[in-house]
């Protein structure tokens, strides 16, 4: 019996087609992805093959103005239109709190939404009961297939699930649910979830009875043969893991942003054992036409976005200096504003010992692309912020050793004075440079804001200590020459859309007046 698994993950509200780098589509003839194009390919496969499942491994939420405006209603609507068969909850599905998951998505999806390792307690337990499930048995042709869901247990640090959801260890939570499926004589079981490629592989190895793992969170690109675009494969597709009980378990993921449609063919014997598995992600490029009816629907929904982008989010009573002349040479108040917004967006009081789990922000000055003049009645719009942060990036959470941070700050000024983008703006950090010293030895003081303290204060950076830092995904990926961050980071979790973080902060503050206050000094 043959099953075709089509899968997406980490789509991050890319409902419209995008450029090759998953930013806003500029030249339509070279654009990729989007739900209209995805629908064309899915329907083509559904017509050609008998047993097809379309699955999503989480993080549909967050990433473009679509999510900012529609808050998840767009996810339910277009996933329903594409007739997804199941979805696992990702960490970003909790970005607007549990209510922001329940109302627009859990109540509106016409397909099951899954997670076995999220347990509700207190008053939420009855409210959310039945709206998401640990597993689902799906009819496929004349057979049934079990799907068991899982979500990163780091979600309380990455999003806003509140205090009434407990995120358990994935493997511990999955095993009894898989066992339950086995007692129901379901012998073909897919683990669908959002904990990253390393956990996907562990699940394949450790959870008895799981036949296939379809993952997300780490934006992992797997491919067999010559890759069709810029993404470099982390391994073959499918990635085969040998389980502790000796089975060959295929593990797949399909990069991110709806650029690819994962395509995996699995052959099962009559006892539900995997005989063979093969496939590859399908690049959704312009050779695949956009479905006209879905495209028309997208255009209808788009109207509200255009209206939103010119509405006032808040006011500034000071000039927001985002000029290259400032932000690439010294502390600029636009950099301070953005870093303060980044920290504010990551406030999670999850431990009595810590006022917050993260206090530090770094931001490449070259990523700040425009100032905002206060003389336009002080008005700040989404459109204004899109000029400041035009690249459609995310502000991510990483863990780094102090020694890596020190290298990053040395890199920040290694060729100071040439208006290069690597000069770092900061939050929760006080840095002093001495430019008379040779490159690589110019940081003379680097103090960081404590987290395990009731009264935050600045202490000298410790080289061997592990710190959490919020930074743009561009830096996490080694951009602007910050190779040491990419090479030495100990953990990396994708965060919220950059403009969304700043716009939310401005809306919350209502009136802003960021200052230059001595975060960056020269001796």
């Amino acid at each position: 019996w043959e099953l075709t698994i089509l899968h997406t993950n980490d789509v991050h509200s890319r409902l419209e087609q995008t450029s090759e780098d998953s930013s806003k589509c500029v030249n339509a003839s070279r654009c990729m992805g989007g739900v209209a194009r995805l629908f064309t390919k899915v329907q083509q496969i559904r017509r050609a093959e008998p047993n097809v499942l379309l699955l999503d491994a989480g993080d549909q939420y967050q990433g473009t103005i679509w999510f900012t405006v529609y808050k998840g209603a767009e996810v339910a609507h277009f996933m329903n239109a594409l007739r997804y068969d199941a979805m696992a909850l990702g960490n970003h599905e909790f970005d607007n709190g549990v209510e922001g998951l329940i109302e627009p998505l859990l109540k509106e999806a016409k397909f099951p939404i899954l997670s076995a390792n999220i347990k509700a307690k207190g008053p939420l337990a009855s409210q959310i009961s039945g709206l998401y499930l640990p597993y689902k048995v799906l009819p496929v042709g004349d057979e049934v297939v079990g799907i068991v869901g899982y979500t990163s247990k780091e979600t309380p640090f990455l999003s806003n699930p509140g205090t009434n959801l407990v995120f358990e260890d994935e493997i511990t939570a999955l095993q009894p649910e898989v066992d339950k499926l086995k007692t129901l004589n379901v012998n073909k079981i897919i683990a669908l979830g959002h904990s990253g490629f390393e956990m996907d592989k562990l699940i394949a190895q450790k959870v008895r009875g799981v036949d296939v793992v379809v993952g997300g969170h780490s934006n992992t690109f797997l491919y067999t043969g010559n890759p069709p675009s810029k993404e470099v494969p982390a391994g073959k597709y499918p990635f085969i893991v040998t389980s502790d009980d000796g089975r060959k378990v295929p593990v797949v993921q399909a990069y991110a942003f709806g650029k690819y449609l994962g395509y995996l063919k699995i052959e099962f014997d009559e006892r539900g054992n995997v005989i063979s598995s093969h496939g590859n992600p399908i690049l959704l490029n312009s050779s695949i036409p956009e479905d006209p009816s879905i495209k028309a629907d997208i255009n209808k929904w788009r109207i509200k976005l255009d209206n939103y982008s010119t509405q006032e989010l808040g006011k500034t009573i000071v000039y927001l200096d985002g000029s290259s002349q400032s932000c690439r040479f010294r502390e600029c108040n636009m950099g301070n504003l953005i870093c303060d917004a980044m920290i504010n967006n990551n406030l999670r009081h999850t431990d009595e010992m810590f006022w917050n789990h993260v206090s530090m922000c770094i931001l490449n000055g070259g990523g700040i692309r425009s100032p905002i003049d206060e003389r336009n009645n002080g008005t700040i719009t989404w459109e204004n912020l899109a000029a400041v942060l035009p690249f459609g990036g995310t502000f991510d959470l990483v863990q780094l050793k102090g020694s890596t941070l020190k290298k990053a700050f040395e890199h920040s000024v290694h060729r100071y004075g040439q208006s290069t983008g690597e000069f770092l703006q900061v939050g929760g950090i006080h840095v002093v440079y001495d430019l008379s010293r040779k490159p690589g030895d110019r940081v003379v003081k680097l103090d960081v804001l404590c987290t395990k303290c009731r009264v935050p204060s600045y202490d000298p950076l410790k080289m061997d200590e592990v710190y959490k830092v919020i930074l743009p995904n561009f830096l996490a990926n080694g951009g602007d020459g910050f190779q040491m961050i990419k090479d030495e980071l100990l953990r990396h979790d994708s965060g919220d859309q950059d403009i969304n973080v700043v716009s939310t902060y401005i809306s919350k503050m209502k009136v802003i007046y960021p200052a230059v206050e001595g975060r960056i000094k020269f001796s």
């Epitope: 509106e108 999806a109 016409k110 397909f111 039945g130 799906l138 009819p139 496929v140 004589n185 379901v186």
Partner: nanobody
Framework: ALQLVESGGGLVQPGGSLRLSCEVS????????IGWFRQAPGKEREGVSC????????YYADSVKGRFTISRDNAKNTVYLQMNSLKPEDTGVYYC?????????????????WGQGTEVTVSS
């Protein structure tokens, strides 16, 4: 919370008719496939009929084809099972069940939400 409540069961003579109702609360009916199942004393639960979320597709077990009709009134959040030409072998507890998805099924394993059941006895 999601709830399904069956009603309309009772004692009926062979050849007679009954109309079972299943009222759902806590969710929007048109997002769910609905199935009717029955369990005769000492037997396995068996699928009788099911209706897709849109109501566009309906399926019946061979044993009831031509005699039973499933219908739904999404506005009233209620699903009905019209049972005609009843036979003694139709006796049992009738359950209505629901699940989200695109493909209606008579396989009990795919249903996530169940009612408490209503008893039907066909006897002279």
């Amino acid at each position: 919370a999601l709830q399904l409540v069956e009603s309309g069961g009772g004692l009926v003579q062979p050849g007679g008719s009954l109309r079972l109702s299943c009222e759902v609360s806590g969710f929007t009916l048109d997002y769910y496939n609905i199935g009717w199942f029955r369990q005769a004393p000492g037997k396995e639960r068996e699928g009788v009929s099911c209706s897709s979320n849109s109501g566009g597709s309906t399926y019946y077990a061979d044993s009831v084809k031509g005699r039973f009709t499933i219908s739904r009134d999404n506005a009233k959040n209620t699903v009905y099972l019209q049972m005609n030409s009843l036979k003694p072998e139709d006796t049992g507890v009738y359950y209505c069940a629901a699940y989200r998805g695109w493909h209606p099924s008579l396989d009990a394993r795919v249903y996530d939400y169940w009612g408490q059941g209503t008893e039907v006895t066909v006897s002279s």
